[in-house]
Structure formats: C-alpha cells, structure tokens
C-alpha cells in the first residue's frame, strides 16, 4: 500500500457516507430508532459513534488533500515552521494510560475541541469535491462538544477561546499564500486526527465507556444531531 | 525500502535489565504509531504495548511497571526497557509499523525479524 | 478486559479446501478487529482490517467477516502456501487487557 507521509492510506476506502451514499444531515438519522431489535445506544457509545464518524470524515478530506498537493510527503520539519498553535494532549492532561484522571482529561478534551473550532471554519472553502463532508465534520464536532459538556462535571474549568481573537486569526490564515494555506488545511487534519485518536483512547478508558453495541460497525458510522441528544 | 530491524536481544539473567533497539529507516518514524509484541518459543503472539504519535503508551497488563516503550525521533528508532526480567520473558521480540483509523485498531502492517532475548540463570 | 478465544486451535485441511477460522471476542469490538498470518520462522504478516479490508497484495481468496463480538477469516480455496497459523488482534481497547492477539489457528495439511 501508498502511504502518505503520516501513515494513512491514500487509497483507503472511507466508509463515511450512509447506506444510499449521501451525508446524513442533523436531525435526519432516523436508523437508530428505526430498527426495532437495536439497543439504545448510551450516551457514552454515542459519543464513541460521534467521534468515529468525524475521524472517518477527516480521513476523506485528507483523501483529497493529499491527491492535490504533495503536503502529505512535508517532513515533519516544514509543518513545524508553520507556527499553528494546535491543541495536543500531554501527560499532564490525564489523558494518557499513565497517570489517567477522568476530570482534568474531560475537561481538556472539550477545552480542545473548542479551540480546533476556528481552525475547522477555515477548513470550510477549503475542499473542492469534499465541501460537504467538511461542513459535516464542522457541524459533527458542534454536537460532540454538546455531548461532552453534558458528560462533564467540572464546566467552569473549560475556558472558551476568545472570538475576537479567533475572528482575527482566521483573517490571518485566508490571508495566507496558496502553498501555506495547503499546509495549514493539511496540518489542521492532520492534528485534529490525533486530537481526536487521543480523546476516544482516554474515552475508552473511562467507566461507562467499555462497550459497544454488537450492531455498531465502524463502516456504518452516521452524523449524530442535537436531537438525539 | 521501509524496514525494521531489531537488536539488543541476548541471555540475560532472571531479575536483570535490557534495552531492545528498533532502527526504522526509509519512513519518518515520528508520524507512524509503533508496538512491540512478543513470542515465546511455540506459542502465540503477546501483545506488549503501543507507543502513539501524541507520544502516549499503552502497555499489557502483564508488561505494566516492568516495561518501558519510547522512541528518538531524531534517531528514528523505537525503544523496549525491560526490567526484572523472569524466565517468562524468554522470547522472540519484535517491533512493528502500525496505522490506527479511531483509538486502538491500530493494524501492524510491516514487522521486524525479531530479536530473540533468553532470560535464564 | 477483552478477551478474544479463536478456534479451532489446530485445522487439518487439504488444497482447495475452504477453510473457515472463528474469534469471538469477549465484549463488542465494533469491526475493530485484524487478521494475520504467520509462518514458521517468519514475523506476522497483516491480511486484513477492520474486520473486512483486504490489505494490499493479499490474495482475495482471503476475506473476513463480523462484527461485534463473531468474526470469520474464511480462506475459499486453501493453496500450498497458505498452511500458517493465523491470528485475530482486537483493536476496540487496549487499556486493562493482557493480550490484544486471540490465541491462534495452526493450519495443517491433512
């Protein structure tokens, strides 16, 4: 197999489309409930769900984003002088095997996503056959952090970035040339992935989180809305 | 050529120490999440633990405490520290390339030769 | 802790047999299981993916199924070179697990 420079593959089938090969769109996945025979999924398992989905939904768009630029074959040199201040876990967070806190790892888990939230608005207008499943991620990763708030005890530890300063930085960012913007789009994917990896392994490891049910396949993941909240 | 090659491995005696080696070349090993897995002479494979690229470890229940996974990037090479090793751990080591799509399925999909340690008195 | 049991533990098959190798793990897995294939001597060797994907350059008499807590490697038509032992790896957690590898199936020939 082709691997790109970060090891995914380039011609890897992305199972994240439903079953009539559209995006499902909030408040429209009726499957769930449809199936009489299906468990309820707990909101622990739908969380699981959720982020399998945006990780399927990342792996498209870097699909793309690797076919039309050589960013993928960037060594890690080049990506590090571009001087994104992107959220990434550490020991301290707890949300590692070692020295694993549920508390501190929640709340850096959602102060996380809400700091990738400017950097996934300026992925919108970046992707020419992917526009869709970019704004499904976005609006995916929306309903992920209302999950998690709900899940989290400890709401006055997560600190909410500023919006002027995130206004100003996306200025910043489209204000870039062509090859720095390919490289940003191909470093923001690429973090959020890991981000993303780093969270479900630290959710997987938290009480309630030990199982899925036997119905739920990875090749069938489906954006889940408010709704189902 | 991708490869991997491991070293370190040799008769150590019961409650001694070894450091295994693993030299990645021709990837960058820094964008590429690695385990280590074992073999004891006729039976099956045993999982030691992961080392991801947000530089988290993952060890067995067996291997916790005892065994240390870290990599140099700069050197491109993936480490295996065993401590207090017991005649259980006599077995062939091997280091292995994996890619992982959500948290833990991360598939070993190119392996080393392995590197036989023998732990006996 | 998951735990994943394969059976059976050894198969007598002939060429051209279809060869069928369950795992069962102990709790859902979602599709999050791999199969390899080690011969004797030789490191593992990745078959398939996400309980399903064939990985590239392997023979597509190989193919996998499952999901949840079955799984099945079925092997259409056994060729010479395909008399190995085979083994399934769980990758829905790792965390609190002795093994993430089932015990493995020695394919034999009869």
């Known amino acids: 197999d082709y691997k790109d420079h970060d090891g995914d593959y380039k011609d890897h089938d992305i199972d994240y489309k439903d079953d009539d090969d559209k995006l499902v769109p909030p408040g429209e996945d009726s499957k769930d409930v449809a199936a009489p025979h299906r468990q309820p999924l707990t909101s622990s398992e739908r969380i699981d769900k959720q982020i399998r989905y945006i990780l399927d939904g990342i792996s498209a768009l870097r699909k793309e984003t690797c076919n039309k630029s050589n960013m993928c074959e960037s060594s890690k040199e080049a990506l590090a002088e571009n001087n994104l201040n992107l959220p990434k876990m550490a020991e301290k967070d707890g949300c590692f095997q070692s020295g694993f806190n549920e508390e501190t790892c929640l709340v850096k888990i959602i102060t996380g996503l809400l700091e990738f939230e400017v950097y996934l608005e300026y992925l919108q207008n970046r992707f020419e056959s992917s526009e869709e499943q970019a704004r499904a991620v976005q609006m995916s990763t929306k309903v992920l952090i209302q999950f998690l708030q709900k899940k989290a005890k400890n709401l006055d530890a997560i600190t909410t970035p500023d919006p002027t300063t995130n206004a100003s930085l996306l200025t910043k960012l489209q204000a870039q040339n062509q090859w720095l913007q390919d490289m940003t789009t191909h470093l923001i994917l690429r973090s959020f992935k890991e981000f993303l990896q780093s969270s479900l392994r630290a959710l997987r490891q938290m009480g309630d989180l030990i199982s899925v049910p036997v119905d739920s396949r990875g090749s069938e993941q489906k954006l889940i809305s408010e709704e189902d909240l | 050529e991708v490869q991997l090659v491991e070293s370190g491995g040799g008769l150590v005696q019961p409650g001694g120490s070894l450091r295994l080696s693993c030299t990645v070349s021709?990837?960058?090993?820094?964008?590429?999440?690695m385990s280590w897995v074992r073999q004891a002479p006729g039976k099956g494979l045993e999982w030691v633990g992961y080392?991801?690229?947000?530089?988290?470890?993952w060890y067995a229940n067996w291997a916790k405490g005892r065994f240390t996974i870290s990599r140099d990037n700069s050197k491109n090479t993936l480490y295996l520290q065993m401590n207090s090793l017991r005649a259980e751990d006599t077995a062939v080591y091997y280091c292995?390339?994996?890619?992982?799509?959500?948290?833990?399925?991360?598939?070993?999909?190119?392996w080393g030769q392995g590197t036989l340690v023998t732990v006996s008195s | 802790d998951i735990q994943l049991t394969q059976s059976p533990s050894f198969l007598s098959a002939s060429v051209g047999d279809r060869v069928t190798i369950t795992c069962q793990a102990s709790?859902?897995?979602?599709?999050?299981l791999s199969w390899y294939q080690q011969k004797p001597g030789k490191a593992p060797k990745l078959l398939i993916y996400?309980?399903?994907t064939l990985t590239s350059g392997v023979p597509s008499r190989f193919s996998g199924s499952g999901s949840g807590t079955e799984f099945t490697l079925t092997i259409s038509s056994l060729q010479p070179e395909d008399f190995a032992t085979y083994y399934c790896?769980?990758?829905?957690?790792?965390?609190?697990?002795?093994?993430?590898f089932g015990g493995g199936t020695k394919v034999e020939i009869k």
């Open positions: 292995a390339r994996g890619s992982t799509d959500y948290a833990f399925d991360t598939r070993l999909d190119l």
């Open positions: 021709g990837i960058d090993l820094s964008s590429y999440d």
């Open positions: 080392i991801y690229t947000d530089s988290s470890t």
């Open positions: 709790q859902s897995i979602s599709n999050e």
């Open positions: 996400r309980a399903s």
């Open positions: 790896q769980q990758g829905y957690n790792s965390n609190d697990v002795d093994n993430v």
